[in-house]
Interface confidence: low
C-alpha cells in the first residue's frame, strides 16, 4: 500500500561507487515514504480527512494510499519513471573509463568494458 | 555543503509561545523532510515531529500535538517550529534535522536554539 | 508508544578496549514494508548528534568500521571493536519505523 522500497543508492555506500558521478552529497531523492503504521490501527489525525493521493492512487482508511504501478510514497507523489541518480538523468547511459553505466529508476547499473585499451 | 541554521536562543515567559526557525542549504529544500528533536538540559533527545517540506504533511509526536506546530516557508528554504502555551519543563535546546525518511531518519543537524522558559 | 531501553547507562572503557551498549525496544519495530528502521546516533560533548548507524546495521557516510551494530525484532546492539578517545560522548538507539519515532535513554561511554 504505498510503502514498498525501492533498492536505490545510499549516501556513501553505492553499489557502483564512482566519486566522479556521484558527488558527496546524496542525490536529492526521497524515496521512502514516511507514513509510519502504527502498530494498532491508526493514530488519529488532524490529516485523516484531507485528499491524500496523488496521481491516481486510492485512499485508504483514511490516510493511506495504495499507489498504482510506478508510484509511491505517502501520497503517491513519487514516480520511479522519472527518478535520477545524481546528475544523471533516468533511462540515460553513461560511458565511463573501463565501463558502460545506466541510470534506471535511481540506480546507476554498470557494466564493465574489459575490452577498451587499459582495461584489463 | 548541507547546512542547517537555526534561529537564535530565546527566553520566554509561561503561557507565551515561541517560534525556531531552520534555515536549510546546500541541498535540494522540498527533498528532504525536516525533524524536530528537542533536549531538556542534562537529559535525553525527544522526537517531537517531521514535515515534508515538498506538500506540507507533517507527522506529530501526540505529546505535544496539540501545542506544536510545523510550517515551511519553501521560498526561502526554511523550516518552523512553533510551540505554545509554553512551561518550564519547555526548557530545551531544539535541533531541527534533515532526513531523506529511506534510508534513515536524520542524517544532517542544525546547531541547535535554546529556549529558555521562565517567570 | 515504542519504548527504546537502553544499557548500560554509563559506559568506562579503557582505550583500545572494546565496548557494548544494547537497546531494547517494547515492540517490534520493523516497517510495514519489511524494513527495520533501528538507528545509531552519538551525540559528542557540546554538539549536535551525528548519525553512525542506519537500518540496524549500516554504517553511515564517514563513519569508522569500528562502529557495527546488529540485532534484529526488539533486540539490537552496537559494538565499537576498539574505543578511541573521540568516540566519547552519549549513544543513542532510535526506532524510525512508527510514530512517534523516538530514542533510548542513552549510554554514556566515558574514557576509563
Known amino acids: 500500500l504505498g510503502h514498498q522500497e525501492f533498492a536505490r543508492p545510499s549516501r556513501g555506500y553505492l553499489a557502483f561507487r564512482d566519486d566522479s558521478i556521484w558527488p558527496q552529497e546524496e542525490p536529492a531523492i526521497r524515496p521512502r515514504s514516511s507514513q509510519r503504521v502504527p502498530p494498532m490501527g491508526i493514530q488519529h489525525s488532524k490529516e485523516l480527512n484531507r485528499t491524500c493521493c496523488l496521481n491516481g492512487g486510492t485512499c485508504m482508511l483514511g490516510s493511506f494510499c495504495a499507489c498504482p504501478p510506478s508510484f509511491y510514497g505517502r501520497n503517491c507523489e513519487h514516480d520511479v519513471r522519472k527518478e535520477n541518480c545524481g546528475s544523471v538523468p533516468h533511462d540515460t547511459w553513461l560511458p565511463k573509463k573501463c565501463s558502460l553505466c545506466k541510470c534506471w529508476h535511481g540506480q546507476l547499473r554498470c557494466f564493465p568494458q574489459a575490452f577498451l585499451p587499459g582495461c584489463d | 555543503e548541507v547546512q542547517l541554521v537555526e534561529s537564535g536562543a530565546e527566553v520566554k515567559k509561561p503561557g507565551a509561545s515561541v517560534k525556531v526557525s531552520c534555515k536549510a542549504s546546500?541541498?535540494?529544500?522540498?527533498?528532504?523532510?525536516i525533524h524536530w528533536v528537542r533536549q531538556a538540559p542534562g537529559q535525553g533527545l525527544e522526537w517531537m515531529g517531521e514535515?515534508?517540506?515538498?506538500?506540507?504533511?507533517?507527522n506529530y509526536n501526540e505529546k505535544f500535538k496539540n501545542r506544536v506546530t510545523l510550517t515551511v516557508d519553501t521560498s526561502i528554504s526554511t523550516a518552523y517550529m512553533e510551540l505554545s502555551r509554553l512551561r518550564s519543563d519547555d526548557t530545551a535546546v531544539y535541533y531541527c534535522a534533515r532526513g531523506p525518511n529511506y534510508f534513515y531518519s536524520m542524517d544532517y543537524w542544525g546547531q541547535g536554539t535554546m529556549v529558555t522558559v521562565s517567570s | 508508544d515504542f519504548v527504546m531501553t537502553q544499557s548500560p547507562l554509563s559506559l568506562p572503557v579503557t582505550p583500545g578496549e572494546p565496548a557494548s551498549i544494547s537497546c531494547r525496544s517494547s515492540q517490534s519495530i520493523v516497517h510495514s514494508n519489511g524494513n527495520t528502521y533501528l538507528e545509531w546516533y552519538l551525540q559528542k560533548p557540546g554538539q549536535s548528534p551525528q548519525l553512525l548507524i542506519y537500518k540496524v546495521s549500516n554504517r553511515f557516510s564517514g563513519v569508522p568500521d569500528r562502529f557495527s551494530g546488529s540485532g534484529s525484532g526488539t533486540d539490537f546492539t552496537l559494538k565499537i571493536s576498539r574505543v578511541e578517545a573521540e568516540d566519547v560522548g552519549v549513544y543513542y538507539c532510535?526506532?524510525?519505523?512508527?510514530?512517534?519515532?523516538?530514542f533510548g535513554a542513552g549510554t554514556k561511554l566515558e574514557i576509563k
Open positions: 546546500g541541498y535540494t529544500f522540498t527533498s528532504y523532510w
Open positions: 532510535f526506532q524510525g519505523s512508527h510514530v512517534p519515532l523516538t
Open positions: 514535515n515534508d517540506p515538498s506538500n506540507g504533511r507533517t
